[in-house]
């Protein structure tokens, strides 16, 4: 099941995830001047089996001067420029990306992307957390957030980061070792009677992706 | 026939605030992704914000982050656009669009266009 929402906003910090789950769907979105093809796929969704995990669907881009026909209401306006992104879900090689059972690598770059990816997380991710550039960790606890199943609903663990304005940055796990927190979780990790599983969780992703992936939001 | 019908603009001065609507009509309000973009005068028309289908997520462009917020209500099948503080520089034609993907910024993942509602920004 997607999370319904998106990983907590730590002030002056940025996330990113150093694998992804089987689930994890990516929008293949394309560059200024260019667009999906046609019946092309709208996403690449991490899949696999108990022993290899990979990237099913392939995102292809082609020239928007090259379509003939449109959908639209009003014609469709010039591409927009190109614009950095301030997100961590944007196309970058984690430092240490174990292989981890389950999960997938970073997708490798598709021609002609667009600048920032946009994936769509499943329960059970984990994702990590840095100060940006000029902010460095005051206290830290676990910098990292995971999405959970809590009676039903989806919700992120809270980071315990804290960035100040001073001109040292914080590394990812693998470049340097987080300090053990002394309060450890911030909220308490109560069970529920229902519960849904990894293995409930794909088994209903691969049942409903084919027929609803046009039009229901894993959400 | 589809159709993406904007209202609510208008004239405000700066510092200002204005919700826009976009109403869905001619199909199921089944789009996963709907966004607001917008155009001003000699401009290239830019993303400004896009929602999920459930609205739990949002994307915004930084140039209206903590002042603009997005909104659906898919019992009236309708998008929203609250726009708080408003500047000069926001003074711009407003687009609802609607896509396939969940949460697009990206202008070519938009099938679909509305009409556009004029929004100015001047004291």
């Known amino acids: 099941e997607l999370c319904d929402d998106d990983p907590p906003e730590i002030p002056h910090a940025t996330f990113k995830a150093m694998a992804y789950k089987e689930g994890t769907m990516l929008n293949c979105e394309c560059k200024r001047g260019f667009r999906r093809i046609k019946s092309g796929s709208l996403y690449m969704l991490c899949t696999g089996n108990s022993s290899h995990s990979s990237w099913d669907n392939q995102c292809q881009c082609t020239s928007s001067a090259t379509r003939n026909t449109t959908k639209q209401v009003t014609p469709q306006p010039e591409e927009q420029k190109e614009r950095k992104t301030t997100e961590m879900q944007s196309p970058m090689q984690p430092v240490d990306q174990a292989s981890l059972p389950g999960h997938c690598r970073e997708p490798p770059p598709w021609e002609n992307e667009a600048t920032e990816r946009i994936y769509h997380f499943v329960v059970g991710q984990m994702v990590y957390y840095q100060c940006v550039q000029g902010y460095r960790a005051l206290h830290r606890g676990p910098a990292e957030s995971v999405c959970k199943m809590t009676h039903g609903k989806t919700r992120w663990t809270q980071p315990q980061l804290i960035c100040t304005g001073e001109m040292e940055t914080s590394q990812f796990p693998g470049e340097e070792k987080p300090q053990a927190s002394p309060e450890g979780r911030p909220e308490s990790e109560t069970s529920c009677l229902v519960t849904t599983t990894d293995f409930q969780i794909q088994t209903e992703m691969a049942a409903t992706m084919e027929t609803s992936i046009f039009t229901t939001e894993y959400q | 026939e589809v159709q993406l019908l904007e209202s609510g603009g208008g004239l405000v001065q700066p510092g200002g605030s204005l919700r826009v609507s976009c109403a869905a009509s001619?199909?199921?309000?089944?789009?996963?992704?709907m966004g607001w973009f917008r155009q001003a005068p000699g401009k290239e028309r830019e993303f400004v914000a896009a929602?999920?289908?459930?609205?739990?997520?949002?994307r915004y462009a930084d140039s209206v982050k903590g002042r603009f917020t997005i909104s659906r209500d898919n019992a009236k099948n309708t998008v929203y656009l609250q726009m708080n503080s408003l500047r000069p520089e926001d003074t711009a034609v407003y687009y609802c669009?609607?896509?396939?993907?969940?949460?697009?910024?990206?202008?070519?993942?938009?099938?679909?266009w509305g009409q556009g509602t004029q929004v100015t920004v001047s004291s």
């Open positions: 001619g199909r199921t309000f089944s789009w996963n992704g």
């Open positions: 669009a609607a896509s396939d993907f969940l949460l697009a910024t990206t202008i070519s993942a938009y099938d679909y």
């Open positions: 929602i999920s289908q459930s609205g739990g997520r949002t």
